[in-house]
C-alpha cells in the first residue's frame, strides 16, 4: 500500500470559540455559560432581578461576589452554574424564584476540539464489557467503512478534512475509493439523518510502517454539535502511568450487551516498563506504542475497534493519545490493549496535513 509520505498540524480546526469564552453578542454558544449579552427577561417576559439584589428573592450562592467571573452584572441573563437549560435569572416575580431566558444560539456555532457538547457517560470498564455511550458524546468517533457500507474499523476526526486510523485497517486496498467514513453516528446501522457520509480522497501511511495512517476526506466534514474533532497532543508527550483514558468503538463485544451501538470504556494507561514485563506483554511493546487496560481483564478494545481513539481528559478537553492497534485476544487478564502513541507522530501528522 503506497506510502504517500509526508506530514501535519491541522488547519485551524474550524474550531469555534470555546463555549466558556465570554460572548457579548445577544446569542449563545452551547449552553450559554459564556453568554455576556444584555437580555434581561425570562421566557415568559418577566424582568430579571439584579444578581446583586436580595429583593424579591434572597439568595447567596450566585452573586457577583461569590462568582466574580460569571458576568453577574445588573440583571442580565447568565448561566453561572452551567445549567443544561441555558441562561437564567432570578425573577422579579415574588412567586417564581428563577426562570430561563430565551437566548438564541449564535448562527455559526463553533466547537473546540476535544469538547463534546453532550457530556460523556464515563463508564468505568472496557468496550468488551464497557457500556453504551451517550449518543454524540464522543463526536470525533469515525466509522471506517467499505464502499458498500460495512463497518470494519474505527477512526478519529482530527480536523474537518482529516481522519486518523490504524495502518492495518487499510491493508485490503491501496485505493481511497475503497473506503468511506461515517461521522456523527451512534448506531452502526440505521444511520440517523444528521450522519455525514464522506468519501476518502487520499491515504497516507506512516513512512516507517508504524500502525498509523491518515485519510484525507474528499470534502470537509461539517463541524456540528455531533461532529467535533479530537485534539492532538503535544509532540512526544508521555501519558502518565495510571492516567484514566477512554476507548470507544462499534467493535466485537464478545456477547456483552450493546452490540450495534457505540460503546465506551474507561481504561488506565500502563507504563511501557510495566507492560513489557514477562507476565504481561513480555517485551512486545515499542516506545511508539502505549498500553492501556485492566490487568484483571474484562474490558478492552477488540476487532472492529482498530483505528479508533483512545482519548484522555486534560484540563478541560479530550486529547487523542492513542490509536487502537493490537492486543493478545480481547479483554484477557494480564494482556492490556496496545495503542499507537499519537504524540510520537504529531510532527508527521501535522506535516501531511500542511502539505496536502
Amino acid at each position: 500500500s503506497g506510502t504517500e509520505a509526508s506530514v501535519v498540524a491541522p488547519p485551524p480546526v474550524v474550531l469555534l470559540p470555546d463555549v466558556e469564552t465570554p460572548s457579548e453578542e445577544d446569542c449563545m454558544f452551547g449552553n450559554g455559560k459564556g453568554y455576556r449579552g444584555k437580555r434581561a427577561t425570562t421566557v415568559t417576559g418577566t424582568p430579571c432581578q439584579d444578581w446583586a439584589a436580595q429583593e424579591p428573592h434572597r439568595h447567596s450562592i450566585f452573586t457577583p461576589e461569590t462568582n466574580p467571573r460569571a458576568g453577574l452584572e445588573k440583571n442580565y441573563c447568565r448561566n453561572p452554574d452551567g445549567d443544561v437549560g441555558g441562561p437564567w435569572c432570578y425573577t422579579t416575580n415574588p412567586r417564581k424564584l428563577y426562570d430561563y431566558c430565551d437566548v438564541p444560539q449564535c448562527a455559526a456555532p463553533s466547537f473546540d476540539c476535544g469538547k463534546p457538547q453532550v457530556e460523556p457517560k464515563k463508564c468505568p470498564g472496557r468496550v468488551v464489557g464497557g457500556c453504551v455511550a451517550h449518543p454524540h458524546s464522543w463526536p470525533w468517533q469515525v466509522s471506517l467503512r467499505t464502499r458498500f457500507g460495512m463497518h470494519f474499523c474505527g477512526g478519529t476526526l482530527i480536523s474537518p478534512e482529516w481522519v486518523l486510523t490504524a495502518a492495518h485497517c487499510l491493508e485490503k486496498s491501496p485505493r481511497p475509493s475503497s473506503y468511506k467514513v461515517i461521522l456523527g453516528a451512534h448506531q452502526e446501522v440505521n444511520l440517523e439523518p444528521h450522519v455525514q457520509e464522506i468519501e476518502v480522497s487520499r491515504l497516507f501511511l506512516e513512512p516507517t510502517r508504524k500502525d498509523i495512517a491518515l485519510l484525507k476526506l474528499s470534502s470537509p466534514a461539517v463541524i456540528t454539535d455531533k461532529v467535533i474533532p479530537a485534539c492532538l497532543p503535544s509532540p512526544n508527550y508521555v501519558v502518565a502511568d495510571r492516567t484514566e483514558c477512554f476507548i470507544t468503538g462499534w467493535g466485537e463485544t464478545q456477547g456483552t450487551f450493546g452490540a450495534g451501538l457505540l460503546k465506551e470504556a474507561q481504561l488506565p494507561v500502563i507504563e511501557n516498563k510495566v507492560c513489557n514485563r514477562y507476565e504481561f506483554l513480555n517485551g512486545r511493546v515499542q516506545s511508539t506504542e502505549l498500553c492501556a487496560g485492566h490487568l484483571a481483564g474484562g474490558t478492552d478494545s477488540c476487532q472492529g475497534d482498530s483505528g479508533g481513539p483512545l482519548v484522555c481528559f486534560e484540563k478541560d478537553k479530550y486529547i487523542l493519545q492513542g490509536v487502537t492497534s493490537w492486543g493478545l485476544g480481547c479483554a484477557r487478564p494480564n494482556k492490556p490493549g496496545v495503542y499507537v502513541r499519537v504524540s510520537r507522530f504529531v510532527t508527521w501528522i501535522e506535516g501531511v496535513m500542511r502539505n496536502n
Epitope: D81, G82, V84, V118, E119, P120, K121, K122, C123, P124, C131, H134, P135, S137, E244, F257, Q266, F313, D316
Partner: antibody, heavy 124, light 107 residues
Framework: AVTLDESGGGLQTPGRALSLVCKAS????????MHWVRQAPGKGLEFVAG????????RYGAAVKGRVTISRDNGQSIVRLQLDNLRAEDTGTYYC?????????????????WGHGTEVIVSS | QAALTQPSSVSANPGETVEITCSGG?????YGWYQQKSPGSAPVTLI????NRPSNIPSRFSGSKSGSTATLTITGVQGEDEAVYFC??????????FGAGTTLTVL
C-alpha cells in the same frame, strides 16, 4: 462494600443555609459521579443535585436551583451540598447517592447505591 | 420536565409475575428503578440505566425499555418484595425526575 455516610442534618432555621456532607468508602470515589436526592415526609423522591467524577460538571434540580451548590473533594472522598435560604418545604430526608458512571448525567436513572440519609427539619 | 406516570398500586400472589410501568421520560431517556420498604428508609437500586441490575439484587428483578416506557418485571414475587417502587428518568440534557411511586402488595 459501598458505604455512604451523610451528616449535617437536624433542626434548621428558615432563611439560613444548610451544609450537608457525604463521606464515601468502599469504591474508587474519583471514578464516579455523586448525587443528592431528597424525600419530603410522606412524599416521593426528588433529585437535588449531581456532580461528575472530577467536579467539572454539575446539575441541579428545578426546585432548588439558584439556592444550591454541590462540590466534591476526591482526596477525602467527600461530596458536599450547600442549600441556601432554607424554607419549610426543604424539610425531608436527604440521601447521598453514587452513580454507576463518571458523568454527572441522569442521576434518577443511573444511581446504583444510596446512603441511609440525614433528616433535615426546617422550622422556626 | 413532565411528570413520570406509574400506577399507584399493584398487587400479586406469591410466585406470580408483576410488571410495573413508567412512562413520560422521552425516547432518549434512561430509566432506573428503586425499592423503598418503609418511609424514611434508604431506597435500594434494583435497576439502573434501563436494564442493569446491581450484583446484590436477585435475578427475579429485571428492567426493560420500549420507546418512552420502561418496565420493571418481578418474576416470582415474594412476600419480602412488598414495598414502594419508584422509577426515575433523565437524559443527557435534563436533570431528571422520579415517579410518584407504586405500592406493591403481596396477597
Amino acid at each position: 462494600a459501598v458505604t455512604l455516610d451523610e451528616s449535617g442534618g437536624g433542626l434548621q432555621t428558615p432563611g439560613r443555609a444548610l451544609s450537608l456532607v457525604c463521606k464515601a468508602s468502599g469504591f474508587t470515589f474519583s471514578s464516579y459521579a455523586m448525587h443528592w436526592v431528597r424525600q419530603a415526609p410522606g412524599k416521593g423522591l426528588e433529585f437535588v443535585a449531581g456532580i461528575d467524577n472530577i467536579g467539572s460538571y454539575t446539575r441541579y434540580g428545578a426546585a432548588v436551583k439558584g439556592r444550591v451548590t454541590i462540590s466534591r473533594d476526591n482526596g477525602q472522598s467527600i461530596v458536599r451540598l450547600q442549600l441556601d435560604n432554607l424554607r419549610a418545604e426543604d424539610t425531608g430526608t436527604y440521601y447521598c447517592a453514587k452513580s454507576a458512571y463518571g458523568g454527572s448525567c441522569c442521576g434518577p436513572a443511573y444511581i446504583d447505591a444510596w446512603g441511609h440519609g440525614t433528616e433535615v427539619i426546617v422550622s422556626s | 420536565q413532565a411528570a413520570l406516570t406509574q400506577p399507584s398500586s399493584v398487587s400479586a400472589n406469591p410466585g406470580e409475575t408483576v410488571e410495573i410501568t413508567c412512562s413520560g421520560g422521552g425516547r432518549s431517556s434512561y430509566y432506573g428503578w428503586y425499592q423503598q420498604k418503609s418511609p424514611g428508609s434508604a431506597p435500594v437500586t434494583l435497576i439502573y440505566d434501563n436494564t442493569n441490575r446491581p450484583s446484590n439484587i436477585p435475578s427475579r428483578f429485571s428492567g426493560s425499555k420500549s420507546g418512552s416506557t420502561a418496565t420493571l418485571t418481578i418474576t416470582g414475587v415474594q412476600g419480602e418484595d412488598e414495598a414502594v417502587y419508584f422509577c426515575g428518568s433523565a437524559d443527557s440534557s435534563t436533570t431528571g425526575i422520579f415517579g410518584a411511586g407504586t405500592t406493591l402488595t403481596v396477597l
